[in-house]
């Protein structure tokens, strides 16, 4: 699949990622033989980023903008290997995949975790939220599971309506063939949606980290 394709353009980097990369390079120059304690290093980077002014961050934001442009440019000309479909253009009008119960729970308790542990990296915040979720009695998870189920139901109705509306030429093709490919297509789209939810969660965390810094 695409993950193993050497020709596939490198993913775009956020301003914070550029900053961390710079920190790593600086650290390597100063301590070429020292091994890096990843969690300690992440914590220090996060603390440093939080104290930086908007002007100082500007350099990394420019780097991120340039990298985004590079990624978009390269993706336009990228042809995936046979057997792998090129990731579709995301229609902004398409219904958004609903959040899971855990995702809803995280939205409630992420501020507390981040507030109590300001130096924590995104990964460690997620880890703590996971522990919190695991320590929560099944009964206390119910409100989140109920809401997630409701949102999933709504999404399924919305996506069905969206697909029906958005496939005008489907009627011209053979009904049997369409039925056969429908299941495969839905499976692919579900896989893609899952990837999107992960991406969105990462982006949300990155945005939040940057928002916190701006406060």
């Amino acid at each position: 699949m695409g993950k193993g394709d050497p020709k596939k353009p490198r993913g775009k980097m956020s301003s914070y990622a550029f900053f961390v990369q710079t920190c790593r390079e600086e650290h390597k120059k100063k301590h070429p033989d020292a091994s890096v304690n990843f969690s300690e290093f992440s914590k220090k980077c996060s603390e440093r980023w939080k104290t930086m002014s908007a002007k100082e961050k500007g350099k990394f934001e420019d780097m991120a903008k340039a990298d985004k442009a590079r990624y978009e440019r390269e993706m336009k000309t990228y042809i995936p290997p046979k057997g792998e479909t090129k990731k579709k253009f995301k229609d902004p009008n398409a219904p958004k995949r609903p959040p899971s119960a855990f995702f809803l729970f995280c939205s409630e308790y992420r501020p507390k975790i981040k507030g109590e542990h300001p130096g924590l990296s995104i990964g460690d915040v997620a880890k703590k939220l996971g522990e919190m979720w695991n320590n929560t009695a099944a009964d206390d998870k119910q409100p989140y599971e109920k809401k997630a189920a409701k949102l999933k139901e709504k999404y399924e109705k919305d996506i069905a309506a969206y697909r029906a509306k958005g496939k005008p030429d489907a009627a011209k093709k053979g009904v049997v063939k369409a039925e056969k490919s429908k299941k495969k297509k839905e499976e692919e789209e579900d896989e893609e949606d899952e990837e999107d939810e992960e991406e969105e969660e990462d982006e949300e965390d990155e945005d939040e980290e940057e928002d916190d810094d701006d406060e």
């Epitope: 308790y109 507390k112 507030g115 979720w133 009695a137 206390d140």
Partner: antibody
Framework: EVQLLESGGGLVQPGGSLRLSCAAS????????MSWVRQAPGKGLEWVSR????????MYADSVKGRFTISRDNSKNTLYLQMNSLRAEDTAVYYC????????????????WGQGTMVTVSS | DIQMTQSPSSLSASVGDRVTITCRAS??????LNWYQQKPGKAPKLLIY???SLQSGVPSRFSGSGSGTDFTLTISSLQPEDFATYYC?????????FGQGTKVEIK
């Protein structure tokens, strides 16, 4: 100092309404689940209701479902309990309590309590 | 709803005594159990959470044990300020339910 201060209790006739408030201070109110717990004169403790940090999720005891509404205003650090269709059996001291969630494998605990406000339902 | 039954309902003890209060749940609640102390005219105070974890600021003479359906609160050496009513509470399911209380009185 971490503190919860209830107000709004009093004497009300059966069928009447009352709105209790709980002012929080000394901690980041918007991070915590909050609850109301009541205690009838000379009796034990009874959990009434719970609300999530954002206010998006609420739970009620069957005895108050459909009559009581829990809400919160995070900008004012205040928790509320709107009590409608009050009955004589609702007579109690109403405590507002902070709920510490999922801190350990033991789930949740009411770790901070207010001093309580007395609600008397009588004609 | 999960029923919580405490025993005894009341007990008389002297300063320095070792006191044990038990709490039984009507179904298994794992370690989802808390203990509170309440003095007359005052709000309850959390002593023990998650069956055996001591809440910060609570003297070490208080301890909790048990899991499943049977739990115990022990006061190793009763002090004058410990004369109060003690409640157990399950946090395994909604509605949260409390035991009927155990009143510890001076002998």
């Amino acid at each position: 100092e971490v503190q919860l201060l209830e107000s709004g209790g009093g004497l009300v006739q059966p069928g009447g309404s009352l709105r209790l408030s709980c002012a929080a201070s000394g901690f980041t109110f918007s991070w915590y689940d909050m609850s109301w717990v009541r205690q009838a004169p000379g009796k034990g403790l009874e959990w009434v209701s719970r609300i999530s940090p954002s206010g998006g999720y609420t739970m009620y005891a069957d005895s108050v479902k459909g009559r009581f509404t829990i809400s919160r205003d995070n900008s004012k650090n205040t928790l509320y309990l709107q009590m409608n269709s009050l009955r004589a059996e609702d007579t109690a001291v109403y405590y507002c309590a902070r709920l510490e969630v999922g801190a350990t494998s033991g789930g949740t605990a009411f770790d901070i309590w207010g001093q309580g406000t007395m609600v008397t339902v009588s004609s | 709803d999960i029923q919580m039954t405490q025993s005894p309902s009341s007990l008389s003890a002297s300063v320095g005594d070792r006191v044990t209060i038990t709490c039984r749940a009507s179904q298994s609640i794992s370690s989802y159990l808390n203990w509170y102390q309440q003095k007359p005219g005052k709000a309850p105070k959390l002593l023990i959470y998650a069956a055996s974890s001591l809440q910060s600021g609570v003297p070490s003479r208080f301890s909790g044990s048990g899991s499943g359906t049977d739990f115990t609160l022990t006061i190793s050496s009763l002090q004058p300020e410990d004369f109060a009513t003690y409640y157990c509470q399950q946090s395994y399911s909604t509605p949260r339910t409390f035991g009927q209380g155990t009143k510890v009185e001076i002998k």
